[in-house]
């Protein structure tokens, strides 16, 4: 049977260094808030990821932007309330030498 | 100032357990091929990720499908050649109890 094979150029294009949605734990971005719980406990952020086709290069952000999100903060013994938290997103990515 | 704040329901929807593109090292899926190099060295696969709104639940695949991709295999001292590699993708995800 003729299985649909993703051609090389498409595989390459989708694997190459770019900003991709990643789910990041809120407390990893706000370690000072570790004693509180947030809902959701993770947020979707754009992060540079992918391969560069050269072991001496890695995928890094060359432009970032802030995004502010509304989350529920769960304070012990109190009703949850909305808070605004600001996160850094990766806007533009490039393959740069590892030694930089 | 009326800064664009991502509202809670949208934050929740984007963070909740779902299949999301992730860049995965080829050799992590094909450890027996560790002595060879592939180009690209990583591939974009759908993987279940996200949070479940409950510490007793985690995001798991409940349906998977195979995808076959064309990559370049670099054999030492030989010209690279195309190979077809099959990977497992996550199609449908659900929040399930951790103990399962």
């Amino acid at each position: 049977s003729e299985v649909e094979v993703v051609p090389f150029q498409e595989v390459w294009g989708r694997s190459y260094c770019r900003a991709l949605e990643r789910l990041v734990d809120v407390v990893s971005e706000y370690p000072s808030e570790v004693e509180h719980m947030f809902s959701p406990s993770c947020v979707s952020l754009l992060r540079c990821t992918g391969c560069c086709g050269d072991e001496n290069l890695h995928c890094v952000p060359v432009e970032t932007a802030n995004v502010t999100m509304q989350l529920l903060k769960i304070r012990s013994g109190d009703r949850p309330s909305y808070v605004e938290l600001t996160f850094s997103q990766h806007v533009r990515c490039e393959c740069r030498p590892l030694r930089e | 100032s009326e800064v664009e704040v991502v509202p809670f329901q949208e934050v929740w929807g984007r963070s909740y357990c779902r299949a999301l593109e992730r860049l995965v090292d080829v050799v992590s899926e094909y450890p027996s091929e560790v002595e060879h190099m592939f180009s690209p060295s990583c591939v974009s696969l759908l993987r279940c990720t996200g949070c479940c709104g409950d510490e007793n639940l985690h995001c798991v695949p409940v349906e998977t499908a195979n995808v076959t991709m064309q990559l370049l295999k670099i054999r030492s001292g030989d010209r690279p050649s195309y190979v077809e590699l099959t990977f497992s993708q996550h199609v449908r995800c659900e929040c399930r109890p951790l103990r399962e």
Epitope: R79 | Q9, G53
Partner: antibody, heavy 116, light 112 residues
Framework: QIQLQQSGPELVKPGASVKISCKAS????????INWVKLKPGQGLEWIGW????????KYNEKFKGKATLTIDTSSSTAYMQLSSLTSEDTAVYFC?????????WGQGTTLTVSS | DIVLSQSPSSLAVSAGEKVTMRCKSS????????????LAWYQQKPGQSPKLLIY???TRESGVPDRFTGSGSGTDFTLTISSVQAEDLAVYYC????????FGSGTKLEIK
Amino acid sequence: QIQLQQSGPELVKPGASVKISCKASGYTFTDYYINWVKLKPGQGLEWIGWIYPGSGNTKYNEKFKGKATLTIDTSSSTAYMQLSSLTSEDTAVYFCVRDSPFFDYWGQGTTLTVSS
Amino acid sequence: DIVLSQSPSSLAVSAGEKVTMRCKSSQSLLNSGMRKSFLAWYQQKPGQSPKLLIYWASTRESGVPDRFTGSGSGTDFTLTISSVQAEDLAVYYCKQSYHLFTFGSGTKLEIK
């Protein structure tokens, strides 16, 4: 204890502007949203907008864009709402309210009367 | 915009009677992942500011008498007062916070 103390009643002429204040005490002002709500005589409650004192970010009900302007002074833990180009339709009681998504602490209300 | 329809607009009952009022939303207020509906009930007594009674559709606010019960999910919600007291004379509003905030038009409770 947590309190929201609003400024006193206002009698203003059509076309004028008014600024209502809401002084918060008993909690960390920058941690909670302040919302403003309108209660018109014989009618129900209407949400005007919110301000997040931690950032100064605001969000308005479309109906009140251009009518209401929300500001804060974090040094005095006070929220303000300015209403402009007043008409008789703006005659109402205005409440400041702490928190979202559920409104837990309300000010005592400020009565605004627009009359020539 | 989400529209909340409250019924009845007013009712009069004797002390000790059971009262039920309803709130219907034009769209679901349920966050299915959280398994919570973004609906609250408020009580406004004459000459006073509104007071939070119920949130998440069924969670009683601290200090609220247990004769007040909220129920429902999605689009249909109910506030029940199991045995009305004279001090329950008030207007009761439902409010959604799924998308921004809107209030129902209120149910005025009178005591015979």
